[in-house]
């Protein structure tokens, strides 16, 4: 009764520094409350990028100052991370927790390598 989490291996951020990917989980139970966390792994350090708890069938609500937005559909979560720069290139891991009802389950994806390329500054025009 393990929970498997799938996410794409690679995603390229657009020119505005926005990257989107789908995090899909195979639920071993019928959860009504789910928490999704995006973690960034750099070297051996893992830090939280953003997190949202949602009731099945409802929208994800990230904190107001979050760089993430998302929507959910069944066992799929569509995640968007904004404001990325080249230095933010790295492995972004999707963690899913089935919070309620019991039992609790946790699943962690293998990570999505997000590549961010800073746009070239526009040349000055005379």
């Amino acid at each position: 009764k393990a929970m498997h989490v799938a996410q794409p291996a690679v995603v390229l951020a657009n020119s505005r520094g926005t990257a989107s990917f789908v995090c899909e989980y195979a639920s071993p139970g019928k959860a009504t409350e789910v928490r999704v966390t995006v973690l960034r792994q750099a070297d051996s350090q893992v830090t939280e990028v953003c997190a949202a708890t949602y009731m099945m069938g409802n929208e994800l609500t990230f904190l107001d100052d979050s760089i993430c937005t998302g929507t959910s559909s069944g066992n799929q979560v569509n995640l968007t991370i904004q404001g990325l720069r080249a230095m933010d290139t790295g492995l972004y891991i999707c963690k899913v927790e089935l919070m309620y009802p019991p039992p609790y389950y946790m699943g962690i994806g293998n990570g999505t390598q997000i590549y961010v390329i800073d746009p070239e500054p526009c040349p000055d025009s005379d």
Epitope: K1, R35, V46, M99, P102, Y104, I108
Partner: antibody, heavy 118, light 106 residues
Framework: QVQLVESGGGVVQPGRSLRLSCAAS????????MHWVRQAPGKGLEWVAV????????YYADSVKGRFTISRDNSKNTLYLQMNSLRAEDTALYSC???????????WGQGTLVTVSS | EIVLTQSPGTLSLSPGERATLSCRAS?????LAWYQQKPGQAPRLLIY???SRATGIPDRFSGSGSGTDFTLTISRLEPEDFAVYYC?????????FGQGTKVEIK
């Protein structure tokens, strides 16, 4: 650096109550699930309870369900364990532990000793 | 509830020797950790996700296995490695620990 410091242990008679505290520092407390784990003298580790993030979701070991209550005050960076109807078999060192980003218990306190005896 | 059974209960070895500790689960486990505990000290996380070393853990410690059979290997025992080792599953509630393996000096 991450620090977890437990307090509130002591000697108590069977049937009585005790409240343990765990003061956390060095990290954003509200972002982490927090566990209580106990260890009877000379025995192994036994998971007791967990409380998640905002405090709404809690889980308990069958051995303490209905008697122990886990809670947290994120404004005070403090975790609690209210222990009622204590039994001799609850005698143990009680430690709080942080659930790390990837799930395992990455930081532990040194523990506070609870002795239930008449 | 997932029951974790560790073997052997006690391992008597000399410094420099290789230690192999086993943890067997009553059903398939997705997320397994290993902890080290010395007398009078809190447990210390060694391995998570069955095979990933925690921050600051020397590379003589390695974890392997999947499903129901897991192994912690200490390639060359140092004097400070003599302690009790616990496995734990953390992928679902209730969180459970093995009963521990004591690694003692022969």
């Amino acid at each position: 650096q991450v620090q977890l410091v437990e307090s509130g242990g002591g000697v108590v008679q069977p049937g009585r109550s005790l409240r343990l505290s765990c003061a956390a520092s060095g990290f954003t407390f509200s972002r982490y699930g927090m566990h209580w784990v106990r260890q009877a003298p000379g025995k192994g580790l036994e998971w007791v309870a967990v409380i998640w993030y905002d405090g709404r979701n809690k889980y308990y070991a069958d051995s303490v369900k209905g008697r122990f209550t886990i809670s947290r005050d994120n404004s005070k960076n403090t975790l609690y364990l209210q222990m009622n109807s204590l039994r001799a078999e609850d005698t143990a060192l009680y430690s709080c532990a942080r659930a790390g980003e990837l799930g395992p218990f990455d930081y532990w306190g040194q523990g506070t000793l609870v002795t239930v005896s008449s | 509830e997932i029951v974790l059974t560790q073997s052997p209960g006690t391992l008597s070895l000399s410094p420099g020797e290789r230690a192999t500790l086993s943890c067997r689960a009553s059903q398939s486990v997705s997320y397994l950790a290993w902890y080290q505990q010395k007398p009078g000290q809190a447990p210390r996380l060694l391995i998570y996700g069955a095979s990933s070393r925690a921050t600051g853990i020397p590379d003589r410690f390695s974890g392997s296995g999947s499903g129901t059979d897991f192994t912690l290997t200490i390639s060359r025992l140092e004097p400070e490695d003599f302690a009790v080792y616990y496995c734990q599953q953390y992928g679902s509630s209730p969180w459970t620990f093995g009963q521990g393996t004591k690694v003692e000096i022969k």
